[in-house]
Interface confidence: medium
């Protein structure tokens, strides 16, 4: 129950990519505003996005403090212009979010091929180690820093002149593959956390092809 002119938020949804994490909800407010609170299982509630008319709240700063914690958020509804007003139960209406564990659930962002270098019949393909907003000792950690061995990359590569794809995997950010001399190849990579049950794979990176300026070629 609550006041007649406020409605509780619903469809609370976590949207998270590479730990950039936003809580979204409905409805668009009519004569009401929202405040969000976030907590770990054992922690105190912390308020964010005070008295907002938005239907989203960026909670990245809170969840990056420990991406292996499990978080719960709740969205409070207040009458616009009278945020002290409460529901008949003596508190504002609120709705709880699903639990969210960033390490297990954040989506893997689209990776980028940083470079490729051909030396004879070998090509070294390097994936950009994307920076996250997770900090340690005042520095931002990369995706590899955070996930360590849990993160692998899959490389898809094929001759420019054909469509038959080959694959390679690495648990670093580099691939060393064999290619046919004199052939141009195209590459795409995908970030994968094989042991996840949800959000296991990123979208594929943009395709990069030999003969374009990303690469460097040294014939031996």
């Amino acid at each position: 129950s609550g006041t007649t002119n406020t409605v509780a938020a619903y469809n609370l949804t976590w949207k998270s990519t590479n730990f950039k994490t936003i809580l979204e909800w409905e409805p668009k407010p009519v004569n009401q505003v929202y405040t969000v609170q976030i907590s770990t299982k054992s922690g105190d509630w912390k308020s964010k996005c005070f008295y907002t008319t938005d239907t989203e709240c960026d909670l990245t700063d809170e969840i990056v403090k420990d991406v292996k914690q499990t978080y719960l958020a709740r969205v409070f509804s207040y009458p616009a212009g009278n945020v002290e007003s409460t529901g008949s139960a003596g508190e504002p209406l609120y709705e709880n979010s699903p639990e969210f564990t960033p390490y297990l659930e954040t989506n893997l962002g689209q990776p980028t091929i940083q470079s490729f270098e051909q030396v004879g019949t070998k090509v070294n393909v390097t994936v950009e180690d994307e920076r996250t907003l997770v900090r340690r000792n005042n520095t931002f950690l990369s995706l590899r820093d955070v996930f360590g061995k849990d993160l692998i990359y899959t490389l898809y590569y094929w001759k420019s002149s054909s469509s038959g794809k080959k694959t390679a995997k690495t648990n670093t950010n580099e691939f060393l593959i064999d290619v046919d001399k004199g052939e141009n190849y195209c590459f795409s990579v995908q970030a994968v956390i094989p042991s996840r049950t949800v959000n296991r794979k990123s979208t594929d990176s943009p395709v990069e092809c030999m003969g374009q300026e990303k690469g460097e070629f040294r014939e031996i």
Epitope: K41, S42, D66, K68, Q69, T70, T101, Y103, L104, K149, D150, I152, K169, T170, N171, I193, P194, S195, R196
Partner: antibody, heavy 118, light 107 residues
Framework: EVQLVQSGAEVKKPGASVKVSCKAS????????MNWVRQAPGQGLEWMGE????????TYNQKFKARVTLTVDQSTNTAYMELSSLRSEDTAVYYC???????????WGQGTTVTVSS | SIQMTQSPSSLSASVGDRVTITCKAS??????IAWYQQKPGKSPKLLIY???NRYTGVPSRFSGSGYGTDFTFTISSLQPEDIATYYC?????????FGGGTKVEIK
């Protein structure tokens, strides 16, 4: 259903080697690190090392690094742990365990008892 | 390597009692702690991961808490089938290390 089935008990003489197998089923074998943990009689758990079944890359506990070798056979979804230069204090139950996302060991084999005795 | 100190090494409690086991890490392990149950002659079973998350199928009477160096494992109402040895393990930094174990018995 995830299952890790280990080879049977072994009795070895000091100085010999033992190779324990762990056959995985019910999941993608190459998607999870396989770990080996041992437990001496009446004692606690001791981590020996882990292997990435996808690449064959291994990490060892420094204590065992000179004597333990971890391998996998992707064609049979089997992980192996070989311990050489056995001594009486290596008498223990040896477990394989699948490492879950983020570190914990979610599935364990039934254990293989290795007895080292002259 | 990170040392894990678990206490007590054994305890005796009555059915229905609240049982608490503590584990102290020699350096911060963030939330990188797991708890296992091992019954005599059986393999260990994962109960808690990331310090406070119950693993699939684990009854709600088992819980974990803590952060950094100090961690607690609780059985809210001890049942006869909970007789076992319980181990903490840090999975924050290799080599992964275990506590010495706590043997739980029924009075």
């Amino acid at each position: 259903e995830v299952q890790l089935v280990q080879s049977g008990a072994e009795v070895k003489k000091p100085g010999a080697s033992v190779k324990v197998s762990c056959k995985a089923s019910g999941y993608s074998f190459t998607g999870y690190y396989m770990n080996w943990v041992r437990q001496a009689p009446g004692q606690g758990l001791e981590w020996m090392g882990e292997i990435n079944p996808s690449t064959g890359g291994s990490t060892y506990n420094q204590k065992f690094k000179a004597r333990v070798t971890l391998t996998v056979d992707q064609s049979t979804n089997t992980a192996y742990m070989e311990l050489s230069s056995l001594r009486s204090e290596d008498t223990a139950v040896y477990y394989c365990a699948r490492r879950e996302l983020g570190g914990p060991f979610g599935y364990w084999g039934q254990g293989t008892t290795v007895t080292v005795s002259s | 390597s990170i040392q894990m100190t678990q206490s007590p090494s054994s305890l005796s409690a009555s059915v229905g009692d609240r049982v608490t086991i503590t584990c102290k890490a020699s350096q911060s392990v963030s939330t990188g702690i797991a708890w296992y149950q091992q019954k005599p002659g059986k393999s260990p079973k994962l109960l808690i991961y990331f310090a406070s998350n119950r693993y699939t199928g684990v009854p709600s009477r088992f819980s974990g808490s803590g952060y950094g160096t100090d961690f607690t494992f609780t059985i809210s109402s001890l049942q006869p089938e909970d007789i076992a040895t319980y181990y903490c393990q840090q999975d924050y930094s290799s080599p992964w290390t275990f506590g010495g174990g706590t043997k739980v018995e029924i009075k």
